[in-house]
Amino acid sequence: EEELQVIQPDKSVSVAAGESAILHCTVTSLIPVGPIQWFRGAGPARELIYNQKEGHFPRVTTVSESTKRENMDFSISISNITPADAGTYYCVKFRKGSPDTEFKSGAGTELSVRAK
């Protein structure tokens, strides 16, 4: 098939308040060249959750776990989850440019938050 795939294997993730949530994303190619970013929600009002190159995201860490040749891991962990973090998270590949343009999005992972 044409070009790359953005794979979010988990349709949903449930996490207890105060714990960390791991949101998995693998990408099958670096080409076209450009960054990966994470968002909560879709459309123009979506919220940027993590951008590797710029910004301050103190609750987010990267958690690359894959050693497979066929894809690369762009998963993240969000610490100290609260009910306000509930929503659908998207791993999005951008194509490098001026400005960068959205190339392909994962299907999304719905995060739900359980009481402690």
């Epitope: 190619s29 670096l30 080409i31 060249v33 990966i36 762009f74």
Partner: antibody, heavy 118, light 111 residues
Framework: EVQLVESGGGLVKPGGSLRLSCAAS????????MSWVRQTPGKGLEWVAT????????YYPDSVKGRFTLSRDNAKNSLYLQMNSLRAEDTAVYYC???????????WGQGTTVTVSS | DIVITQSPASLAVSLGERATISCRAS??????????MHWYQQKPGQPPKLLIY???NLESGVPDRFSGSGSRTDFTLTINPLQAEDVATYYC?????????FGGGTKVEIK
């Protein structure tokens, strides 16, 4: 068994043109990013060009941008590098290489030699 | 451009001993915890062959006496124990950012 076989190298005068070809077999060519890498005794290994699996996106270093054009024919499992306005510094062994993820070069051909000299 | 400084340029090691090669990038080649530095072996008259991908992952079919480590800007290839068939030139390569670049190579010989 994966095979990448380059052809089209030779002796050409400065300012001239050459078209290199790479015939691929033993893997799903249309799923792979493909590249050319060249090697000279003086400069070592140098990345020359890359094309996405579907052929939509191409990338070149400044040293060849505007002079070299990379294309592919997935129906023929073939990769092509059109080299124009050749310079003496383009003299090298040119390798065709595959990249499953567009990252590391997983398979390399045996290379074809390009000599640019008057 | 990311410049890769590979050292040493040549290395003589006794059979059965450890060979260590270093590559330092002028800026980080990491993204999301992936280190986009790779290692290749080239024997005379042959093309390069992938040994290690993404800093520390052994390519299928490569003997486990080869190992890679490092992150961000500093990376190491280790051969332990060195065998006669490991005589070759070794190159590192970064694909963290365009233009992709290579180290200058390390020629490994038997002492």
């Amino acid at each position: 068994e994966v095979q990448l076989v380059e052809s089209g190298g030779g002796l050409v005068k400065p300012g001239g043109s050459l078209r290199l070809s790479c015939a691929a077999s033993g893997f799903t060519f249309s799923s792979y990013v493909m590249s050319w890498v060249r090697q000279t005794p003086g400069k070592g290994l140098e990345w020359v060009a890359t094309i996405s699996s579907g052929g939509t996106y191409t990338y070149y270093p400044d040293s060849v941008k505007g002079r070299f054009t990379l294309s592919r024919d997935n129906a023929k499992n073939s990769l092509y590098l059109q080299m124009n306005s050749l310079r003496a510094e383009d003299t090298a062994v040119y390798y065709c290489a595959s990249q499953l993820t567009g990252s590391e070069f997983d398979y390399w051909g045996q290379g074809t030699t390009v000599t640019v000299s008057s | 451009d990311i410049v890769i400084t590979q050292s040493p340029a040549s290395l003589a090691v006794s059979l059965g001993e450890r060979a260590t090669i270093s590559c330092r990038a002028s800026e980080s080649v990491d993204s999301y915890g992936n280190s986009f530095m790779h290692w290749y072996q080239q024997k005379p008259g042959q093309p390069p062959k992938l040994l290690i991908y993404r800093a520390s992952n052994l390519e299928s079919g490569v003997p486990d006496r080869f190992s890679g480590s490092g992150s961000r800007t500093d990376f190491t290839l280790t051969i332990n124990p060195l065998q006669a068939e490991d005589v070759a030139t070794y190159y590192c390569h970064q694909s963290g950012d365009l233009p992709w670049t290579f180290g200058g190579g390390t020629k490994v010989e038997i002492k």
